[in-house]
């Protein structure tokens, strides 16, 4: 097809040789077309113009991407020739950086429903350059963490060395959707929730006397649980006495909840106190019985083959510990009457 009618956009990707980083291209079809298309439109359905030159399709993956070889050969279908480039709905993901990604990328709808649709396409001229050493040494990472429940910020890597006053107007996207209220080089998050994670894209325009182009950077943001500030708590046993039958086997379970820690070295053990003596008991291995995003429950059992009179005089103590501190719960055995 003839690409001379495609709208054109120039983009610059300056990648750091020190870190892994990704890049994305959006299929930025002209606004009316896009409204029926990739769900990246800024119009609500009621605002869509009545007479659209391109009727599009609601199938989010109904876009074809091509690369234009520099030698003038025919357009190449991205999916067939470039394994390090993946199409996800209307977005093209570049998984690895490199100057070999430079080139012209064209997207257009797969379904052509009217003669007007032939020109419904976008040509993106991508220039890829490694970051020079002269660039800012402490630029923001392309992988940024936000601590759940606290205040945080997401910085645009290509602008993080500039003060807010110097910074040009920035366009931000999150998971391909425009964040229309964000215009500075930093997004401030008052309270971090898990839905703040995702792929953020920041764009700003740079110009010289000849032309202007969009400088783009991609930031992978993840939300992480902060290390616990609490020592573990023992969920079971709750009572400090336990009724037992003499001569019968007995299992006492200790279940303790440990808050999340990146470096996790939980301790859970049983020991016995008998008058002035105390000793650790050799018991089966501890096992994790529950793991959530914020905590983990570990269980360790003490097994008595048969309860003796001597056991009634002892205290069985469950001891648990993390990097913050320790907790104990003791159990005194009491003979069942009747």
């Amino acid at each position: 097809f003839n690409i001379s009618g495609c709208s054109t956009k120039k983009l610059l990707w300056t990648y750091s040789t020190r870190s892994e980083e990704e890049f994305v291209l959006f299929c930025d079809l002209p606004e009316p077309q896009k409204s029926h298309f990739c769900h990246r439109n800024r119009l609500s359905p009621k605002q869509v113009p009545e007479h659209l030159p391109f009727m599009g399709s609601n199938d989010l993956s109904d876009v074809q991407w091509y690369q234009q070889p520099s030698n003038g050969d025919p357009l190449e279908d991205i999916r067939k020739s470039y394994p390090h480039i993946i199409q996800d709905k209307c977005t093209l993901h570049f998984l690895t950086p490199g100057v070999n990604n430079s080139g012209s990328y064209i997207c257009r709808p797969k379904m052509i429903k009217s003669p007007y649709d032939v020109a419904c396409c976008v040509k993106m001229i991508l220039e890829v350059k490694p970051q020079t050493n002269a660039s800012c040494e402490y630029s923001a990472s392309h992988k940024q963490d936000l601590l759940l429940g606290s205040t945080g910020s997401i910085s645009c890597p290509s602008l993080s060395c500039q003060s807010d006053a110097q910074s040009p107007a920035v366009t931000w996207y999150k998971n391909g959707k425009l964040l229309s209220v964000e215009r500075s080089n930093r997004i401030v998050v008052d309270e971090v929730y898990d839905y703040h994670q995702g792929t953020y894209v920041c764009d700003y325009t740079q110009s010289d006397t000849v032309s202007s182009w969009t400088v783009r950077a991609v930031v992978q943001v993840r939300t992480i649980v902060g290390d616990t500030k609490l020592k573990p708590d023992i969920l079971d046993p709750v009572e400090d006495t336990l009724e037992v039958e003499l001569g019968k086997p007995l299992t006492i379970s200790c279940k303790a909840r440990f808050g999340f820690e990146r470096v996790f070295n939980p301790v859970i053990k049983w020991y016995i106190k008998d008058s002035d003596l105390e000793w650790e008991v050799s018991v089966p291995e501890a096992k994790s019985i529950k793991s959530t995003l914020k905590d983990e429950i570990i269980e360790r059992n003490i097994i008595l083959e048969k309860v003796t009179q001597r056991d009634l005089r002892r205290k069985f103590v469950c001891f648990v510990q993390n990097s913050i501190g320790n907790t104990t719960q003791s159990v005194q055995l009491k003979e069942k009457r009747g």
Epitope: N175, Q197, I224, V225, I289, S291, T292, I297
Partner: antibody, heavy 115, light 111 residues
Framework: SLEESGGRLVTPGTPLTLTCTVS????????ISWVRQAPGKGLEWIGH??????AYYASWAKGRFTISRTSSTTVDLKMTSLTTEDTATYFC????????????WGQGTLVTVSS | AAVLTQTPSPVSAVVGGTVSISCQSN????????LSWYQQKPGQPPKFLIY???TLASGVPSRFKGSGSGTQFTLTISDVQCDDAATYYC???????????FGGGTEVVVK
């Protein structure tokens, strides 16, 4: 987003591995659950892979099902000794807090076990 | 093993009316509130409605209300709409993950 793959028609006794591929989700800070639904029946929680990559299972699923994080974007569900009772749509979903609190779901992949 | 018993299906509701679905557990859920509710329509994955027994998930209308703690929980839909016709599931999390389970589901029919 999450996408399940690998569902197909198999004969009883055949092992099968399903894959949940995530995008825009980091498995270092997100846990993934597997849930299944037999045709016309209710939902069944199979188990989950936590943020450290450890697996936890419903009591009925222990032994025959294995959940493992196979890469930074994939979580597998391996099933052995399949019977006709295992015919179902298998969903993967992101855990939001506790493990049956699932806020993002894939569309599911159908596994049919038939002789 | 844990068992979650839901109101038997189907439950009828009238547009503009109120409908309640109960979910009973044979043992306490984790933290007494680790119970979620889901809505499912034919051919679709479940939709997350309520978590921690009573907190509404993002984007869920305030017509949906969850209540209860420990072993007894209720989902109430007020000002019922035609679009609320679906099957609703409760899901419980327990002190041991091996007990985690869904309820059997309750179909809500809107007239």
């Amino acid at each position: 987003s999450l996408e399940e793959s690998g569902g197909r028609l198999v004969t009883p006794g055949t092992p099968l591995t399903l894959t949940c591929t995530v995008s825009g989700i980091d498995l270092i800070s997100n846990a993934i659950s597997w849930v299944r639904q037999a045709p016309g029946k209710g939902l069944e929680w199979i188990g989950h892979s936590d943020i450290r990559g450890s697996a936890y299972y419903a009591s009925w699923a222990k032994g025959r099902f294995t959940i493992s994080r196979t890469s930074s974007t994939t979580v597998d569900l391996k099933m052995t000794s399949l019977t006709t009772e295992d015919t179902a749509t298998y969903f993967c979903a992101r855990i939001a807090d506790v493990n049956t609190q699932l806020d993002l779901w894939g569309q599911g992949t159908l596994v049919t076990v038939s002789s | 093993a844990a068992v979650l018993t839901q109101t038997p299906s189907p439950v009828s509701a009238v547009v503009g009316g109120t409908v309640s679905i109960s979910c009973q557990s044979n043992k306490n859920v984790y933290d007494n509130n680790a119970l979620s509710w889901y809505q499912q329509k034919p051919g679709q994955p479940p939709k997350f409605l309520i978590y921690r027994a009573s907190t509404l998930a993002s984007g869920v209308p305030s017509r949906f209300k969850g209540s209860g703690s420990g072993t007894q929980f209720t989902l109430t839909i007020s000002d019922v709409q035609c679009d609320d016709a679906a099957t609703y599931y409760c899901a419980g999390d327990y002190i041991s993950d091996s007990d985690n389970t869904f309820g059997g589901g309750t179909e809500v029919v809107v007239k």
